[in-house]
Interface confidence: low
């Protein structure tokens, strides 16, 4: 019968010929009366056999990531009779892995959006690297993730590549962050190869800022001839938030005379002071009203940022008109 062990050849061997093992018949008494032959894909070009001894050699550098095993056939012939000594047999040569591929991030570029002020531990995004080496061969394709840039705001789980928030962030201070993640094979041991990727993390706005008036005092004038409904001027607050979180509503907080109203122009986010009742210079030549401003949409959990509405004082001077 045939005698052989499992055949393995390491990939990327630089020697011109590398001994893999021996293939022989147990009828072979070593007197060079048998001839061994190798058949199949790779026979003669990639692998050769010593016709007398049955020793098998790899004569080409192999790449496991291109081809991980070769199925060949062996024959043994009695030189004297030209007849087969053993039935033709199939055998396998496995290409064993070396760590010659670095981890690669295939889904680049990574971009994520996370609300500002998110608590520690909030999941941002998962990055995944792949390694072309053999996952079943030692640690060649076992990856560990680490953070090269992004502390102290972000952390990465070493085995999963899950990026989490590790410190609260304020969009109004910085609205985007670049995080650099490294993936290392060989679970970080010597000889490890690595790859990196960048993740752009944008902070979306939450309503953590209340609108505040630009001025503590506004001075407006109104003609005593102005009809009710007249716009007599505008006031304006600013809000460090954006979008709907910066939409605001103006209202009258104090107007003992009940002469004025404030409506909100939602396009410009200005408060428009409107004359509600006609004024008479002779009756009263100036008015003082207090206005307040609040955000339009404030979720319950963010009310703590909006406890006291910003207010402003408006002095309104009535202009005299000569009466006929």
């Amino acid at each position: 019968g045939w005698v052989w062990n499992q055949f393995f050849v390491p990939e990327e061997m630089n020697t011109t010929s590398h001994h893999i093992g021996q293939l022989r018949s147990d009828l072979d008494n070593g007197n060079n009366s048998f001839q061994y032959k190798l058949l199949g894909a790779g026979a003669g070009s990639t692998f050769i056999i010593d016709e007398r001894t049955g020793d098998i050699y790899a004569i080409q550098k192999l790449d496991r990531e291109e081809r991980s095993l070769y199925i060949l056939r062996a024959q043994v012939i009695d030189i004297a009779t030209g007849r087969a000594v053993e039935p033709e047999s199939e055998f396998v040569i496995k290409v064993s892995d070396i760590n010659d591929n670095e981890p690669k991030f295939l889904d680049e570029p990574y971009e994520a959006i996370v609300p500002e002020m998110s608590p520690e531990g909030t999941l941002v995004i998962q990055v995944t690297a792949s390694d072309a080496d053999d996952p079943s061969s030692g640690n060649n394709a076992r990856l560990l993730y680490s953070l090269l840039q992004g502390q102290p705001y972000f952390s990465v789980e070493p085995t999963t590549g899950v990026i989490r928030i590790s410190s609260k962030m304020d969009r109004e201070l910085q609205d985007e962050y670049w995080v650099i993640i490294q993936a290392k094979d060989m679970i970080g041991q010597p000889g490890a190869l690595s790859g990196t990727t960048s993740v752009l993390i944008k902070l979306s706005d939450v309503n953590d800022n209340k609108p505040i008036f630009k001025e503590s005092l506004y001075r407006l004038t109104v003609s005593e001839s102005a009809p009710t409904g007249t716009s007599i001027g505008t006031i304006m607050a600013y809000d460090n938030d954006i979008g709907e979180n910066a939409e605001m509503d103006y209202s009258i907080e104090e107007d003992d005379s009940q002469t004025f109203d404030i409506i909100t122009n939602h396009e410009t986010q200005e408060g428009i002071v409107i004359l509600k009742k006609k004024v008479d210079f002779e009756h009263q030549n100036h008015y003082g009203i207090r206005a307040k401003v609040k955000n339009h949409h404030v979720p319950e959990q963010l009310m703590k940022y909006h406890t006291e509405a910003s207010t402003t004082f408006i002095k309104i001077q009535v202009e005299d008109v000569d009466e006929p």
């Epitope: 944008k202 706005d205 630009k214 600013y238």
Partner: antibody, heavy 119, light 107 residues
């Protein structure tokens, strides 16, 4: 990568109409407010109009109000500018621009399309 | 509307020199809602600075912005050959308006 490509420009007579298109790719079109900005030959930039991300709010420069209409088709990832009652002073390169997600500046611009209003 | 006035109209400098461009607003620009753009002939504008001082993605650190209220500045610390272009400021505090532009040309 983000790309904005305008088309539809050309020569038109005063009083005529033209519809500009801006094909967007490389980003989630429905998440961004979009603008048209124009630049007369040899002149500076002039903001023309904006449309909100969901298409419900529009806002125009005084110089075009009542004559131009901005619109968008999210299913086609396309922004439009319908220009009616065109005047000689509307002659310009028209750019579409994406409003930055986190503020109101314009982070990406198309290459522009030239509109010439001339008899 | 807020009117922006840029100065100077033209700035003639040599590569390696420092460029300082000014933008003045007719009224206060809230929250430093001011941007700077670069435009080269035949090209679309490119965002350099937003929020008066934040550099846009991919913009070299030789570009910096500063200012608040009504006075804003764009500084190019050391001019590179590719920096010669027209620069526009833009406010987005209330609607959107642009300055008339400053041309930075090779001396």
């Amino acid at each position: 990568q983000v790309q904005l490509v305008e088309s539809g420009g050309g020569v038109v007579q005063p009083g005529g109409s033209l519809r500009l298109s801006c094909a967007a790719s490389g980003f989630t079109f429905s998440s961004y407010d979009m603008h048209w900005v124009r630049q007369a030959p040899g002149k500076g930039l002039e903001w023309v109009a904006v449309i909100s991300y969901e298409g419900t709010n529009e806002y125009y420069a005084e110089s075009v109000k009542g004559r131009f209409t901005i619109s968008r088709d999210t299913s086609k990832n396309t922004l439009y500018l319908q220009m009616n009652s065109l005047r000689a002073e509307d002659t310009a390169v028209y750019y579409c621009a994406r409003e930055r997600y986190f503020d109101w500046s314009f982070d990406y611009w198309g290459q522009g399309t030239l509109v010439s209003v001339s008899s | 509307e807020i009117v922006l006035t840029q100065s100077p109209g033209t700035l003639s400098l040599s590569p390696g020199e420092r460029a300082t461009l000014s933008c003045r607003a007719s009224q206060s620009v809230s929250n430093t809602y001011l941007a700077w753009y670069q435009q080269k002939p035949g090209q679309a504008p490119r965002l350099l600075i937003y929020g008066a001082s934040s550099r846009a993605t991919g913009i070299p650190d030789r570009f910096s912005g500063s200012g608040s209220g009504t006075d804003f500045t764009l500084t190019i610390s050391s001019l590179e050959p590719e920096d010669f272009a027209v620069y526009y400021c833009q406010q987005y505090s209330n609607s959107w308006t642009f300055g008339q532009g400053t041309k930075v040309e090779i001396k």
